[in-house]
């Protein structure tokens, strides 16, 4: 029962004598597993006997018998799932009809497989696609019928008979469904493939020759051109004539329409093979080419550069930058178009020739004021000189050159003049825009540049000026050397060191901070009377005499200056003690008596001691001794004793007479 | 407006001094170089001198080469000429010229007229 | 040595087309040059500086019917609908410097008459 039956194997197996053939194949008996397997070569059914004759390849029986062919032919499969077979070597009367006899226990089945075995190794096929055009990636397919485990083959690629450098991938197939050996080539074809030959060889193991099959390729592609131009280097002369030639090289399909490009761009009205070109301009050099398209598209010739030679055009300088600063670097370029190429350049500078500037480009690297100017040049190639311009000025800016402060004053300047003074400038670009002074002070600036000091001071000793424009330099600072009487004058003691003692050795200086001229005289006084003319006084021995109010001053060309007064103090014993009496040396008893201890003493007495006719010391210790009342036993002579820091002095006696009152003469 | 006004010229001996002077007004005085230029009666046009902007650049024609001394004060925006040992063929009108571009002598003073004869 | 050449004298009917050449030396045929109109009395005017590529720039003033152009050594100075005014001499002239010598030369001159 045919239901019963499933089976898979490709319809037809191609191979070729000596080869050997693979039939991958699978089947199914529902009703248990195979018993038997005949394989038969063409079979027919014999109606007479009911079973089938034919060569008998294959037999697997239950008695185990197994024809000669058994080793040439083998059964790979199972009893149940795989029925695959093998024919090594196969051999040109295998063609026809393999019959597989198969037997389970109650179904039988005759499965037939078509076997087509060639004398020789049948040729490959290529795939070609439908169209191929230049640089656009194809794959070449070549697919051969055959594959068989024992029949190693390879597949190879020829371009007009060379092996082909780009890599081929090979797979074979050996399934139910499909039995082949397939090569494919991925590959750019270019114009210059059109019409070549295509070879797929089919080689064994060791590379020999089986068979192949070949194809022409059919490229198509825009046109290719050649341009021919004369004269052939394209190098001429303003004035004369080029012909240029477009040639069509190769084209797939034809051209249809042609046309020429200058520098990308088309030129109009010219659309034949031949470009004429008559007394050219310089404005016609550049890059040539033809251009023809076909259905693919528009091809190009390669360009032609066109170099139409003339003498250098008027040259015109470039500067980077100007205005300059001083010390920056400048770059001049002289701009001038020739063709060839200026073999020499000159430079200029304000007219006179710059030896040893021969290049386009001049650079200075520091820039002074004395580079400023005017630059021009002049190029030169094989041709000519080209028009040399008026140039390009190279403006050099810098700070003030050479500033000067300038006293305008007659000399000398004396304290409490007027001093005006200017800042000069030797040059200065750009021009000088404003003025600095120091020290600053609440001057005026009458003008630009001028200063004026009102009464000027003592003490200004230096004035710098700067004048700027974007910069400021300063002049160094000049000195007004303000002329001034002696400042500052007055009495200092140089001895002795403590306080002045009557008798000591005196020494006062005569001081002044400054004086302008240093030339100066001295004069000491004292209480309106001139007393010396040198910068010292002395006292050999001070005496308090010469205590008082002392001054000294100091003159110069200018003026004289005075010190404040100066008081000297000599400091001396008690001296000159007296004692008075009051009211007088005679008194009468019962009155009253004062005695008064009178000297002259510097500091004053700080102490008295009061003495009488017998040295004996009295109980008394002011200036004053008054005796109330007096008695006639206080007669007699008294004398004082005064005492002060530096001494002691005492006075002569003085004799007080006490007499009798009248009362007391009238008792007696 | 440009205005270019040439004075100075007049009747001078031959071997005499003459010096011309030029205002300029209504452009940038020290942005442009300058010329005198001079035309004899019935004759062509005759360059005389040039001076660049900043008077870096002095050029004179053969003919008054050592005789006569260009020279300009930008900031009086006044261009000068002075002329020594005069001679009878320096008889011209003298036109004082502004250059600008490459050398376009682009506005023309009304001249000032110097007759040199005994 | 740097020479304009120009020719002498032209005559043009009102409102034609005039076409003045002034051909430079030809080894300078580079140079850049400038046209001037110089009328009876007056001073020069200038017209225009004038290119090899026949470029142009023209001075204050000018009216466009003055236009100019270049062929090779030969530079052109073009007037169309030439008027009554235009009845002057027109010279060429060109400047260059040479070594450490500056020149400016000038073509002889052509007078232009405008007939009718």
């Known amino acids: 029962d045919s239901s019963k039956w499933v089976f898979e194997h490709p319809e037809t197996l191609y191979a070729w004598e000596g080869a050997c053939v693979w039939i991958p194949c699978t089947y199914r008996a529902l009703d248990g597993d195979l018993e038997s397997f005949i394989l038969f070569h063409n079979p027919e059914y014999n109606k007479n006997t009911s079973k089938f004759d034919g060569t008998r390849l294959y037999e697997s029986t239950k008695d185990g018998k197994v024809p000669s062919e058994q080793k040439r032919v083998q059964f790979l499969g199972d009893k149940n799932k795989n029925c695959t077979l093998s024919i090594h070597p196969v051999h040109l009367n295998d063609s026809g009809q393999l019959g597989l006899r198969m037997e389970s226990k109650t179904e039988k089945w005759m499965e037939r497989i078509h076997l087509n075995v060639s004398e020789r190794p049948f040729p490959p096929h290529i795939q070609l696609p439908p169209e191929i055009q230049e640089s656009q990636e194809v794959t070449l397919t070549c697919l051969l019928n055959f594959s068989c485990y024992g029949y190693p083959i390879q597949l190879q690629w020829l371009l007009e008979g060379v092996p082909m450098r780009q890599a081929a991938v090979t797979s074979t197939s050996l399934t139910i469904k499909s039995v082949f050996t397939r090569s494919e080539l991925k590959f750019s074809p270019q114009w210059s493939h059109h019409g070549k030959i295509v070879t797929c060889q089919l080689q064994d193991a060791d590379g020999k020759f089986l068979s192949n099959d070949t194809v022409q390729l059919n490229v198509k592609h825009t046109p290719k051109l050649e341009i021919k131009v004369t004269p052939s280097d394209a190098i001429v002369r303003e004035g004369d004539s080029v012909t240029m030639t477009c040639e069509v090289s190769s084209s797939n399909p034809e051209y249809t329409t042609v046309s020429w490009l200058k520098d990308g761009t088309s030129l109009k009205k010219q659309n034949t093979f031949t470009l004429n070109l008559r007394e050219v301009t310089k404005d016609q050099s550049g890059k040539y080419c033809c251009q023809v398209s076909n259905d693919v598209g528009p091809g190009r010739s390669e360009e032609v550069f066109l170099q139409v030679q003339y003498a250098p055009e008027p040259s015109t300088v470039q500067i980077l930058h100007s205005p300059a600063v001083e010390g920056s670097q400048v770059e001049f370029l002289c701009m001038s178009l020739a063709n060839p190429l200026p073999t020499n350049y000159t430079w200029y500078h304000n007219g006179k020739e710059m030896q040893g500037r021969t290049e386009e480009k001049v650079h200075i690297p520091k820039i002074l004021p004395w580079h400023a100017g005017t630059y021009s040049c002049v190029a030169e190639n094989i041709l000519g000189t080209g028009q040399r311009g008026p140039g390009a000025e190279l403006d050099v800016q810098y700070p003030p050159k050479k500033v000067t402060t300038v006293i305008q004053n007659p000399m000398p300047i004396r304290e409490g003049d007027t001093v005006t003074l200017s800042c000069n400038y030797n040059s200065s670009n750009p021009s000088v825009t404003r003025y600095e002074w120091k020290p600053h002070g609440a001057w005026e600036e009458p003008s630009l540049g001028v200063l004026k000091i009102q009464n000027v001071g003592w003490d200004n000793t230096t004035i710098a000026c700067a004048a700027c424009n974007s910069w400021c330099s300063w002049a160094s600072p000049v000195a007004l050397n303000v002329q001034y009487a002696p400042r500052d004058v007055r009495v200092r003691k140089i001895k002795p060191l403590s306080e002045i003692h009557s008798g000591n050795s005196v020494s006062l200086q005569c001081d002044f901070s400054s004086s302008h001229p240093k030339e100066v005289q001295f004069f000491w006084e004292k209480n309106g009377r001139l007393l010396g003319k040198e910068s010292q006084l002395n006292f050999d021995s001070i005496s308090p005499e010469d205590a008082g109010s002392y001054s000294c001053w100091v003159n110069n060309s200018i003026g004289q200056t005075a010190s404040k007064a100066w008081t000297l103090e000599v400091l001396y014993a008690p001296r000159r003690l007296r004692v008075s009496m009051s009211p007088g040396d005679q008194v009468m008893e019962g009155k009253s008596a004062t005695l008064t201890c009178e000297s002259d003493a510097n500091p004053p007495v700080s102490h008295y001691t009061w003495f009488d006719w017998n040295n004996q010391s009295l109980p008394y210790h002011s200036q004053k001794l008054r005796l109330e009342p007096v008695k006639v036993q206080h007669s007699g002579a008294y004398w004082c004793q005064g005492t002060n820091s530096v001494g002691k002095g005492r006075s002569p006696l003085s004799t007080l007479t006490v007499y009798y009152s009248p009362e007391t003469i009238g008792r007696r | 407006e440009v205005q270019l006004v040439e004075s100075g010229g007049g009747l001078v001996k031959p071997g005499g001094s003459l010096k011309l002077s030029c205002a300029a007004s209504g452009f940038t005085f020290s942005d442009y170089g300058m010329n005198w230029f001079r035309q004899a009666p019935e004759k062509g046009l005759e360059w005389v001198a040039y001076i660049s902007r900043g008077s870096h650049t002095i050029y004179y024609a053969d003919t008054v080469k050592g005789r006569f001394t260009i020279s300009r004060d930008n900031a009086k925006n006044t261009l000068f000429l002075q002329m020594t040992s005069l001679r009878s063929n320096d008889t011209a009108m003298y036109y004082c010229?502004?250059?600008?571009?490459?050398?376009?002598?682009?506005?023309w003073g009304q001249g000032t007229s110097v007759t040199v004869s005994s | 040595q740097l020479v304009l050449t120009q020719s002498s004298s032209a005559s043009f009917s009102l409102g034609a087309s005039a076409k003045l050449t002034c051909t430079l030396s030809s080894q300078h045929s580079s140079y850049i040059i400038e046209w001037y109109q110089q009328q009876p009395l007056k001073p020069p005017k200038y017209v225009m500086e004038l290119k090899k590529d026949g470029s142009h720039s023209t001075g204050d003033g000018i009216p466009d019917r003055f236009s100019g152009s270049s062929s090779g050594a030969d530079r052109y100075l073009s007037i169309s609908n030439i008027q009554p005014e235009d009845e002057a001499i027109y010279i060429c002239?060109?400047?260059?410097?040479?070594?450490?010598?500056?020149?400016?030369?000038f073509g002889g001159g052509t007078k232009v008459t405008v007939l009718g």
């Open positions: 002239g060109v400047g260059d410097t040479i070594k450490e010598q500056f020149v400016y030369v």
């Open positions: 010229v502004r250059m600008a571009g490459y050398y376009a002598m682009d506005y």
